[in-house]
């Protein structure tokens, strides 16, 4: 058999669907979560009303070698308009608590639920 | 000095499918994501899409999913993008756009005209 | 398919303030769409103005600013300047992509 060019492309993901992979994958992270996520790293907390995506991104990519947050690391980079790198805190204008990852990704996943049962895909 | 230089027109048959670059200088591609927007004679802007240079990750609008193809080559610091299946409503001047946090759509190329005549 | 509704013209006079709105049509604008503003000058000259609602990119003048009033991303300028006679574009991202509204002509007399 003969693979032929690369991946094939997926059709357009909707916010909505979008929305709620991101949502079932904070789930898996937090049901599936027996030793401390990420062996208890600590990350920036954020403002879940102020442009939070890219802010969760920021915070989150600082966080290396931790495959249980790479596919949400992944899913955040294509939920924020600019790039983000590691060290980068241009979104977190406020930095000043620090939260385990995994008290992070709960804040992240309720308030991402409220969002979507108030229909707010953006 | 930041510069984008996009490819000259194109005339291209209905049908047919057009590649237009955008090369970099002043900066790495790697480091941004490059966006591509559409501009129609008389009309507004239509964003097609964006590609993280560096991995080759790209998000598309709906409408342009099955029409664009984005992709760049960072050794010669230029990003791509293919149209495919050109019809007329693809006539248009097409513009690459440098986006960051801290300089979001500063820097455009100075767009390439794309003709689709038979 | 969201829509993003801008004003169609605007006029002011220099030294006057003028606000520019950027309206979707899935609700309330926030601060994850990211709310941008572009400027097109004659020959197809852009620059981008304000991104992340109310970040003024390098070199802008001081006298433009975004933010968000009541369910609306706004541009606002504050001092009018004839060299300000432009169209304004304003761009919210929807969770994976842009949609651009249909500009507006800001005329300066």
């Known amino acids: 058999l003969t693979c032929l060019g690369g991946f094939a492309s997926p059709g357009p993901v909707p916010p909505s669907t979008a929305l709620r992979e991101l949502i079932e994958e904070l789930v898996n992270i937090t049901q599936n979560q027996k030793a401390p996520l990420c062996n208890g790293s600590m990350v920036w907390s954020i403002n879940l009303t102020a442009g939070m995506y890219c802010a969760a991104l920021e915070s989150l990519i600082n966080v290396s070698g931790c495959s249980a947050i790479e596919k949400t690391q992944r899913m955040l980079s294509g939920f924020c308009p600019h790039k983000v790198s590691a060290g980068q805190f241009s979104s977190l204008h406020v930095r000043d608590t620090k939260i385990e990852v995994a008290q992070f990704v709960k804040d992240l996943l309720l308030h991402l639920k409220k969002l979507f049962r108030e229909g707010q895909f953006n | 000095e930041v510069q984008l230089q996009q490819s000259g027109a194109e005339l291209v048959k209905p049908g047919a499918s057009v590649k237009l670059s955008c090369t970099a200088s002043g900066f790495n591609i790697k480091d941004y994501y490059m966006h591509w927007v559409k501009q129609r004679t008389e009309q507004g802007l239509e964003w097609i899409g964006r590609i993280d240079p560096e991995d080759g990750e790209t998000k598309y609008a709906p409408k342009f999913h099955d029409k664009a193809t984005l992709t760049a080559d960072t050794s010669s610091n230029t990003a791509y993008l293919q149209f495919s299946s050109l019809a007329s409503e693809d006539t248009a001047v097409y513009y690459c756009?440098?986006?960051?946090?801290?300089?979001?759509?500063?820097?455009w190329g100075q767009g390439t005209l794309v003709t689709v005549s038979a | 398919q969201a829509v993003v509704t801008q004003e169609s013209v605007l006029t002011t006079s220099p030294g006057e303030t003028v606000t520019l709105t950027c309206r979707s049509s899935?609700?309330?604008?926030?601060?994850?769409?990211?709310a941008n503003w572009v400027q097109e000058k004659p020959d197809h000259l852009f620059t981008g103005l304000i991104g992340?609602?109310?970040n003024r990119a390098p070199g802008v003048p001081a006298r433009f600013s975004g933010s968000l009033i009541g369910d609306k991303a706004a541009l606002t300028i504050t001092g009018a300047q004839t060299e300000d006679e432009a169209i304004y574009f304003c761009?919210?991202?929807?969770?994976?992509?842009?949609?651009f509204g249909s500009g507006t002509k800001v005329t300066v007399l």
């Open positions: 761009a919210l991202w929807y969770i994976n992509h842009f949609i």
């Open positions: 992340g609602t109310n």
């Open positions: 899935t609700g309330a604008v926030t601060t994850s769409n990211y």
């Open positions: 756009t440098r986006y960051d946090y801290y300089g979001p759509f500063a820097y």
